[in-house]
């Protein structure tokens, strides 16, 4: 090999030992039956060499660097060449690095052609191994800019009083340009200026100065982005860290073309701005530290840019002003992560705050739009409390559990809608009334409506879940004892065309023992199935809970147990079930841990069952399913 | 709900010291700074500075170096300031609030009911 | 330190009535100002964060607006519980100072 490097030119080549290998046998730079480790070349110098192995690219890295001096005569702008030409030189790993020293009144900027680049993280490399290095100086101190790839949207960094770019190139690529130009630019008043270009959907993640360390202290860095007119941005900060400042505090500006507040000022904790069509400013501005315990500044960040979708311009007015106790959020479903570009689904407050999701809260109107390519990827869930304080004023007082159409209006889909029923303890009590009989869901009868109703305690320490119950059965009121929630939980979006059988009204009335008692008002022409509280985890020790069912005059009801013991196991106490006639009062009383249960019975008036359970041991709980059906009465027994 | 629970009244004699909680409930007490502010009749209302558990430390106003000290412990969710070297002019109404992020740089969002202190011989 | 000067410093007004009560700091503090009403005997209650925005749960009759230098406080239709000493505060920059207070007392 031969390296020639011209007077003047600034140029210094080293060749050097990369990182060791555990390659057993050694490799040297052969100049004249020398053998060396390390040769410099220096401007106006010529060497000639060669390698002592077959693959020095496996021991030996190559760096070439020029000096560009523009403090003492004009600045060389333009097209930066690769110099020596890559064809000169070994096939090693070479880091070509130009450091381009100016005044502090001159702005230079960088420009790259395409394709972009695209800033990786600590610890990230690039695909192709082809990396730029871009520093910057402060009076003497040396700053990172940051470390980026090929194929990204930064098309120009602007710096002043100078800029020091390494360009790193694995040994077997082809790359014989720079890729890049300099041209000086009026001072830019700040560390630097990154230009960042969409020509489309996408995004880009960016960091501040010297990421993971701290940003300069006092410093002021700007990223523009250009945005094409008819898409939409929005930033979300991925990472950051606050120093210890001394007065004024670190801040981020947005300047956004068209707003009303240039430039909009938020502190790093804030929600930023979404929904910005076209171009803008983000600027990040440090603080003064304190001296004893500075701390650090730092900021990852990302863009998306996406189409707006239909819905980005509408605005939806959602009135809680005489709402009370009520908070509405709007969220992200569940999903399985993709790893394929996936546009961003927004909600946004006042058109410009956006997140992915958005708590409203009663007392106030709110206007909210969204930015979002498929609504069905969010949802809503809503919470209210309905409290009772004074049990003389609430006693018999009645309240509407239906989902306003303010929130029925939205074109996001309604998961659940909760409503917490709060009572005086050992003073009230609660009846639910649905507008339509409910039907209990079963794995014999399961709910196919669009929604149920899941009922549940509302007592933190009481694990109690009454049931899930849908439209179209046979109960006709549910009464509990104490604080409860219920929950509207919608199954499909035909929920929007079903949402006229919703309708459950609440009354407090007085207090009473039992943890629940049903209604149940069977029609001739179905089975009802019902089933304890808490299914599946076994009814509360030491809880009772009754059905009192109704018989028409003309029918006969049928009651079947779907086994044949009830499996509790008693660790203190009894369990017990008593059914009774409404009529006689005559009742029959079955031990549910020791009697085998009732055979099939048939009731010809109105009866109760009741059921208390013990404290069962662990493991063996209270479980019951049973069925009632009523047929016509053959014989007239009255 | 959140709350933030401030200790009672205080009579102390002029040149003593005394400590202040406050108590924060129904929230992450961590995630959350705590400012303390007071209330007198001379100088309405007053920053004395904030305690940031999320960035571990305190800021003062510089009228008040030396005169208040704010500690955390985090085992009981609880804020304190000491007031040292007292004179007749620290009797006033002393509130936490809080920060209404993990820094020190938000609005205060929720305040506790202030402490009452007296400052007399 | 920022000034925050705050009128006028008292007032009296009917119910239902429309109440503006300004802020001006001695500097532009990039809307970072919150206002908080203390009613007698109780703590101070935050309504209005960034200049304009209603903290949950706040009525909507009350309102915020102002930048740079100038903040306005708005309560559209007064209410009795709605009297108490109502304080702006400035979270631009350390430290934290506030206004001097505006009594609202029901005519």
């Known amino acids: 090999f031969e390296i020639a490097l011209p007077r003047e030119s600034n140029i210094t080549v080293l060749i050097k030992l990369g990182t060791p290998t555990l390659l057993a046998k050694p490799c040297y730079i052969v100049i004249s039956k020398r053998h060396i480790t390390m040769l410099s070349i220096k401007s106006g110098e010529r060497i000639v060499f060669t390698f002592s192995c077959q693959s020095p690219e496996n021991h030996f890295v190559i760096e070439i660097q020029k000096n560009i001096d523009c403090m003492s005569g004009p600045c060389p702008f333009g097209e930066v060449q690769l110099q020596p030409s890559t064809s000169l030189l070994p096939t090693l790993n070479r880091t070509f690095i130009w450091d381009v020293k100016a005044h502090k009144s001159i702005g230079l900027e960088l420009q790259f052609s395409i394709p972009r680049l695209r800033q990786i993280g600590p610890g990230e490399s690039c695909p192709d191994g082809v990396t730029h290095s871009i520093s910057g100086r402060i009076d003497a101190t040396v700053v990172r800019i940051g470390t980026f790839c090929s194929n990204g949207t930064v098309s120009r960094i602007k710096m002043q009083e100078g800029v020091k770019m390494a360009l790193h190139l694995p040994w077997f690529h082809p790359r014989n340009v720079s890729g890049f130009s300099i041209a000086n630019r009026s001072s830019i008043k700040r560390l630097c200026i990154i230009e960042s270009v969409f020509e489309g959907e996408g995004s880009a993640t960016l960091m501040s100065a010297n990421y993971p360390e701290g940003f300069p202290e006092d410093e002021l860095m700007t990223w523009q982005f250009v945005v094409p007119a008819h898409l939409r941005a929005s930033v979300s900060f991925l990472n950051f860290n606050l120093s210890n400042c001394e007065r004024k505090e670190e801040r981020v500006e947005y300047y956004i073309p068209g707003s009303t507040t240039n430039p909009e000022v938020f502190k790093l904790e804030d929600k930023q701005p979404g929904n910005m069509a076209g171009n803008f400013n983000l600027s990040l501005q440090g603080c003064d530290q304190d001296a004893q315990s500075p701390g650090i500044l730092r900021l990852q960040f990302q863009v998306l840019v996406q189409h707006p979708q239909n819905e980005s311009n509408k605005i939806y007015v959602v009135d809680l002003s005489n709402e009370r106790a009520m908070s509405l959020t709007i969220e992200p479903r569940p999903v399985k992560q993709s790893r394929k570009f996936v546009p961003g689904c927004f909600v946004c407050l006042e058109s410009r705050t956006c997140s992915s999701n958005l708590t409203l809260t009663s007392g106030s109107k709110h206007k909210i739009s969204f930015l979002c390519d498929d609504l069905t990827r969010l949802w809503m869930n809503v919470e209210k409390t309905i409290s009772c304080t004074d049990h003389r004023y609430c006693q018999r007082k009645s309240y509407s559990l239906q989902v306003p159409s303010d929130i029925l209006h939205l074109p996001v889909e309604l998961h659940d809608f909760s409503w917490k029923l709060l009572v005086p303890k050992d003073r009230l009590s609660l009846v639910l009334v649905p507008a339509q009989k409910l039907q209990q869901h079963t794995h014999e009868k399961p709910c196919n409506t669009s929604f149920s109703y899941l009922v549940a305690s509302a007592i933190p320490s009481q694990d109690l879940y009454f049931g899930s119950f849908c439209p179209g059965g046979s109960i006709k009121q549910i009464q509990v004892k104490q604080n409860i929630s219920v929950t509207l939980r919608t199954f499909a979006p035909s929920f929007q065309q079903e949402a006229s059988r919703q309708g459950l009204t609440v009354s407090f009335i007085p207090y009473f023992k039992e943890e629940g008692v049903f209604t149940v008002t069977p029609d001739t022409k179905s089975k009802v199935y019902l089933r304890t509280p808490n299914w599946d985890r076994g009814l509360p020790s030491l809880t009772s809970v009754s059905w009192n069912i109704s018989v028409p005059r003309d029918q006969v009801a049928c009651l079947t147990f779907f086994k044949e013991r009830s499996g509790v196991v008693c660790q203190t106490g009894r369990a017990f079930m008593i059914i009774q006639e409404q009529r006689t009062r005559a009742e029959e009383i079955f031990s549910l841990d020791e009697d085998v249960l009732p055979k099939p019975s048939f009731h010809h008036h109105s009866f109760w069952v009741n059921i208390s359970n013990c404290s069962p041991t662990s493991g063996k709980q209270l479980d019951l399913l049973f069925s009632v059906t009523l047929t016509p009465r053959t014989v007239d027994l009255t | 709900q959140v709350q933030l629970q401030q200790s009672g009244p205080d009579l102390v004699r002029p040149g003593e010291s005394v400590k202040i909680s406050c108590k924060g409930s129904?929230?992450?007490?961590?995630?959350?700074?705590i400012h303390w502010v007071r209330q007198s009749h001379a100088k309405s209302l007053e920053w004395i500075g904030v305690?940031?558990?999320?960035?571990?430390?305190?800021k003062y106003n510089q009228n008040f170096k030396g005169k208040a000290t704010m500690t955390v412990d985090k085992s009981s969710n609880t804020a304190y300031m000491e007031l040292a070297r007292l004179t007749s002019e620290d009797s006033a109404i002393y509130y936490c609030a809080r920060d209404c992020y993990g820094s020190n740089r938000g609005y205060f969002d929720y305040w506790g009911q202030g402490t009452t202190l007296t400052v007399s011989s | 330190d920022i000034r925050m000067t705050q009128s006028p410093s008292s007032m009296y007004a009917s119910l239902g009535e429309r109440v503006t009560i300004t802020c001006k700091a001695s500097?532009?503090?990039?809307?970072?100002l919150s206002w908080f009403l203390q009613r007698p005997g109780k703590a101070p209650k935050t309504l209005i964060y960034?200049?304009?925005n209603l903290v949950e749960g706040v009525p909507s009759r009350f309102s915020g607006s102002g930048s740079g230098q100038d903040y306005s406080l708005i309560i559209s239709n007064l209410e009795y519980e709605d009297m108490g000493i109502y304080y702006c505060l400035q979270y631009d920059e350390f430290p934290r100072t506030f206004g001097g207070g505006t009594k609202l007392e029901i005519k």
């Open positions: 500097q532009d503090i990039n809307r970072f």
């Open positions: 129904g929230y992450t007490f961590t995630d959350h700074a």
């Open positions: 960034r200049a304009n």
């Open positions: 305690i940031s558990f999320s960035y571990d430390n305190t």
